[in-house]
Amino acid sequence: APVRSLNCTLRDSQQKSLVMSGPYELKALHLQGQDMEQQVVFSMSFVQGEESNDKIPVALGLKEKNLYLSCVLKDDKPTLQLESVDPKNYPKKKMEKRFVFNKIEINNKLEFESAQFPNWYISTSQAENMPVFLGGTKGGQDITDFTMQFVSS
């Protein structure tokens, strides 16, 4: 069966939107009005992995682009990147682990934990216009809580 996917946007708990920053990075900033069109639309695919009531494995692709968020070691540190894939083969139900995030719902907020690197989360900073990154702390200065907005296909 084909993998189930939905289109959505994400905002952090400060209401910052996610936009492209160069070809292989995302950044977070406050958008309003027409600028909202800049925000990236994700194709969130529901993939194979360890699942529970509040934890669902997903892959986060950029809609109509052959780019997926992935988690890799760079200089011995878990790092978030946008990775190009062959569109003929993706998305798929059994995604490589670096593409998989555990979507965790807590109090109507979402966290995205790397399946490859447990306790590392998609994170943004309090500051405006700074990169989205993989952070190893929760509940500190860095923001790990998001809300999801559904986008019609």
């Epitope: 900073s125 500051a127 405006e128 216009n129 700074m130 952070g135 702390t137 200065q141």
Partner: antibody
Framework: EVQLLESGGGLVQPGGSLRLSCAAS????????MFWVRQAPGKGLEWVSV????????RYADSVKGRFTISRDNSKNTLYLQMNSLRAEDTAVYYC???????????WGQGTLVTVSS | DIQMTQSPSSVSASVGDRLTIICRAS??????LAWYQQTPGNAPKLLIH???SLQSGVPSRFSGSGSGTDFTLTINSLQPEDFATYYC?????????FGGGTKVEIK
């Protein structure tokens, strides 16, 4: 008053290492992104590296990637730049700067000179 | 990487002149542009951020305009302390990049 004071520069041989420090005062250091920017003698400005307030996010210019490491100690209000495998082309005045709204440098230190020469 | 090109690279002007410096980005940087002033032997000083916003404490004779790829710094009525080198810098994406600088000299 915001103050940034760099130290640790000097003369070093090619292949050698140096660690620069930047002591911050007059603002809540732990809340700000910080940059290192350098300027070779008689040349323009070159961005080197950035670190987030928590230290969780860092980025580097391609010219220093794999050789330089940015870090910070918020308990000491100090920013660092560990510079390894130094080359002649790393010779420059190194400035630390506080990051303002959206990615500008709103306050700068006075700079510290690094000279890489045999 | 985004390339930033400044023009002119140097200019001679007199006290009281109106001066315009141009900065062009190799791709759209929205309004994520800053302007700095640097005098010999000193660190750069932020003049303008977000393309048009005057940094606190900077005289109102300095102004910035533009968005997308084309930006200008205007100095109305040059003062003796304005003879310096000016740099633009994009903050749209990392690596951050500066223009090559514009040296403003006394005619």
């Amino acid at each position: 008053e915001v103050q940034l004071l760099e130290s640790g520069g000097g003369l070093v041989q090619p292949g050698g290492s140096l660690r620069l420090s930047c002591a911050a005062s007059g603002f809540t250091f732990s809340k700000y992104f910080m940059f290192w920017v350098r300027q070779a003698p008689g040349k323009g400005l070159e961005w080197v590296s950035v670190i987030s307030p928590s230290g969780g996010m860092t980025r580097y210019a391609d010219s220093v990637k794999g050789r330089f490491t940015i870090s910070r100690d918020n308990s000491k209000n100090t920013l660092y730049l560990q510079m390894n495998s130094l080359r002649a082309e790393d010779t420059a005045v190194y400035y630390c700067a506080r990051v303002g709204y959206g990615g500008n440098s709103d306050y700068w230190g006075q700079g510290t000179l690094v000279t890489v020469s045999s | 990487d985004i390339q930033m090109t400044q023009s002119p690279s140097s200019v001679s002007a007199s006290v009281g002149d109106r001066l315009t410096i141009i900065c062009r980005a190799s791709q759209d940087i929205n309004r994520w542009l800053a302007w700095y002033q640097q005098t010999p032997g000193n660190a750069p000083k932020l003049l303008i951020h977000s393309a048009t916003s005057l940094q606190s404490g900077v005289p109102s004779r300095f102004s910035g305009s533009g968005s997308g790829t084309d930006f200008t710094l205007t100095i109305n009525s040059l003062q003796p302390e304005d003879f310096a080198t000016y740099y633009c810098q994009q903050a749209e994406s990392f690596p951050l990049t500066f223009g090559g600088g514009t040296k403003v000299e006394i005619k």
